[in-house]
Amino acid sequence: THLGIRLPLRSGLAGPPLGLRLPRETDEESEEPGRRGSFVEMVDNLRGKSGQGYYVEMTVGSPPQTLNILVDTGSSNFAVGAAPHPFLHRYYQRQLSSTYRDLRKGVYVPYTQGKWEGELGTDLVSIPHGPNVTVRANIAAITESDKFFINGSNWEGILGLAYAEIARPDDSLEPFFDSLVKQTHIPNIFSLQLCGAGFPLNQTEALASVGGSMIIGGIDHSLYTGRLWYTPIRREWYYEVIIVRVEINGQDLKMDCKEYNYDKSIVDSGTTNLRLPKKVFEAAVKSIKAASSTEKFPDGFWLGEQLVCWQAGTTPWNIFPVISLYLMGEVTNQSFRITILPQQYLRPVEDVATSQDDCYKFAVSQSSTGTVMGAVIMEGFYVVFDRARKRIGFAVSACHVHDEFRTAAVEGPFVTADMEDCGYNIPQTDESTLMTGRA
């Protein structure tokens, strides 16, 4: 992923679907592509561990080799471990697959905090808890890596679900989802429900926990409450969107909206945090600090380096503000807002020294590559990647963590003028898009 600081994931919470399923509201959105309603076989097909990403089970080759694959909407390569590695329990063994075809080409992908390289080929791929199809897809067989695989994460590869423009080594390498749609009758749409744990998980719980759902080919109504609101995909490379306004507890940050999207804003399941451009981050932290000033936290907490802990069950959620991002709507001069709670942006972590406490990291961080709406945002919502209609939908997730006083929200419409001006135009000479790195 163009990854400012972005490691293989960079923090997706995982855990059983929690929270109340609120009563359904009538859907007002226009008809959507794909099968509607129930995708029972795909519900709860994601697992993960806090900060280590959400993964889906996939099979590769003939006979099928089963691997767990990180779901990443911030990159576009399907890449799997294909050589022994200390952190891998299993890996793709091309020599055992009768359907593997070598493309005789190498690929190198550097992230800011990790890198991998491998050999390109194609093979037959399927998703056991997904659509009942098998497709021939490009696969990067990872033969060498550095700080990419995570010890104990339980995944062995990465499924880049973004567009061909950011595929490595170049845009001629067709991404998995493009191959899937091209070779089957599956509609060009998928949706993600990432379910944050809401509390620290010990090793046993984490490994057993359900982390959410990836619905391929449509929308499952049981996974969200209220209605879906859609924002246009600005450009098909990352899943780029436009943020038009930011509020902390209803207080507008009052910045030039271009700052919110400098140099882009993307929806990235492969990043843990809500990452904000430097100026925006500084303004947001100042506002969050002010709102939560009844308690004092060390600077290291706001930098995401230090934990804060409270006695079990006493986390003062109410002192922390909600964060609202207003996204460009589908109608001219219309926007909608998505609101997350501290239950999303304070990430539960286990502190070995004080296991009787509830400990958290601040999961909003600074970025030099634009806004990244990572797991922190996505865990509040059911997110629909409607590629067919070049739009991304947000609805309140049926599994988001909340309390009796506040819940995540998706609300609109709001009148917002000149939203097109909020998008940043990357200069043609800028080669930064060739860089990769993320956290």
């Epitope: 190498g106 033969t143 170049d170």
Partner: antibody, heavy 124, light 107 residues
Framework: EVQLLESGGGLVQPGGSLRLSCAAS????????MSWVRQAPGKGLEWVSA????????YYADSVKGRFTISRDNSKNTLYLQMDSLRAEDTAVYYC?????????????????WGQGTLVTVSS | EIVLTQSPATLSLSPGERATLSCRAS??????LAWYQQKPGQAPRLLIY???NRATGIPARFSGSGSGTDFTLTISSLEPEDFAVYYC?????????FGGGTKVEIK
């Protein structure tokens, strides 16, 4: 200063075997990809084989695949090329060369410097 | 495999003249192409990597250009020590392949 010293060349009969070594010094050997390139007398250069820094990835030219094996011992700072089933057309000066990083495909990670080479002659 | 064709095979020039060497690939190699210089009895030396970047210690008179299938090595003003054989090499696809070489000789 980076130094690469090839050894192990010599005269061998067709069908025979030879093991070339490349002793490296002046850099952290295990952090760099390495390669073998050959040059037949009076001819151009031909890439033979390459290995990543860890030795986890190895690649061969079609002309030597199945007959030659590249390996490395990072504790001994040495690169090897085991050559079996040798043919007359394998006669050449064999050079070892240091990569620009541990990676084989990274931008900028080309092979330089090269050793002075060792001559392998396959003849009956 | 990707075939690299270098032209001309021999270039006869005088010191101070400009040398233009061509390397054409049978299919796109993006910018995964380098140029090496080899003098008689010596090992090759890297001049240009990734099509247009000068290697460490290489004089500014050497420059590379091109991407895809057509590449050029230019020596703006030949020095006596530049008379040698020049090879292009690609590592876009396996096997990595060298061109046949261009010999730059003194006229």
């Amino acid at each position: 200063e980076v130094q690469l010293l090839e050894s192990g060349g010599g005269l061998v009969q067709p069908g025979g075997s030879l093991r070339l070594s490349c002793a490296a010094s002046g850099f952290t050997f295990g952090s760099y990809a390495m390669s073998w390139v050959r040059q037949a007398p009076g001819k151009g250069l031909e890439w033979v084989s390459a290995t990543s820094g860890s030795g986890g990835s190895t690649y061969y030219a079609d002309s030597v695949k199945g007959r030659f094996t590249i390996s490395r011992d990072n504790s001994k700072n040495t690169l090897y090329l085991q050559m079996d089933s040798l043919r007359a057309e394998d006669t050449a000066v064999y050079y070892c060369a240091k990569g620009g990083s541990q990676w084989l495909y990274a931008p900028g990670s080309w092979f330089d410097p090269w050793g002075q080479g060792t001559l392998v002659t396959v003849s009956s | 495999e990707i075939v690299l064709t270098q032209s001309p095979a021999t270039l006869s020039l005088s010191p101070g003249e400009r040398a233009t060497l061509s390397c054409r690939a049978s299919q796109s190699v993006s910018s995964y192409l380098a140029w090496y210089q080899q003098k008689p009895g010596q090992a090759p030396r890297l001049l240009i990597y990734d099509a247009s970047n000068r290697a460490t210690g290489i004089p500014a008179r050497f420059s590379g250009s091109g991407s895809g299938t057509d590449f050029t090595l230019t020596i703006s003003s030949l020095e006596p020590e530049d008379f040698a054989v020049y090879y292009c090499v690609q590592r876009s696809n396996f096997p990595w392949t060298f061109g046949g070489g261009t010999k730059v000789e003194i006229k």
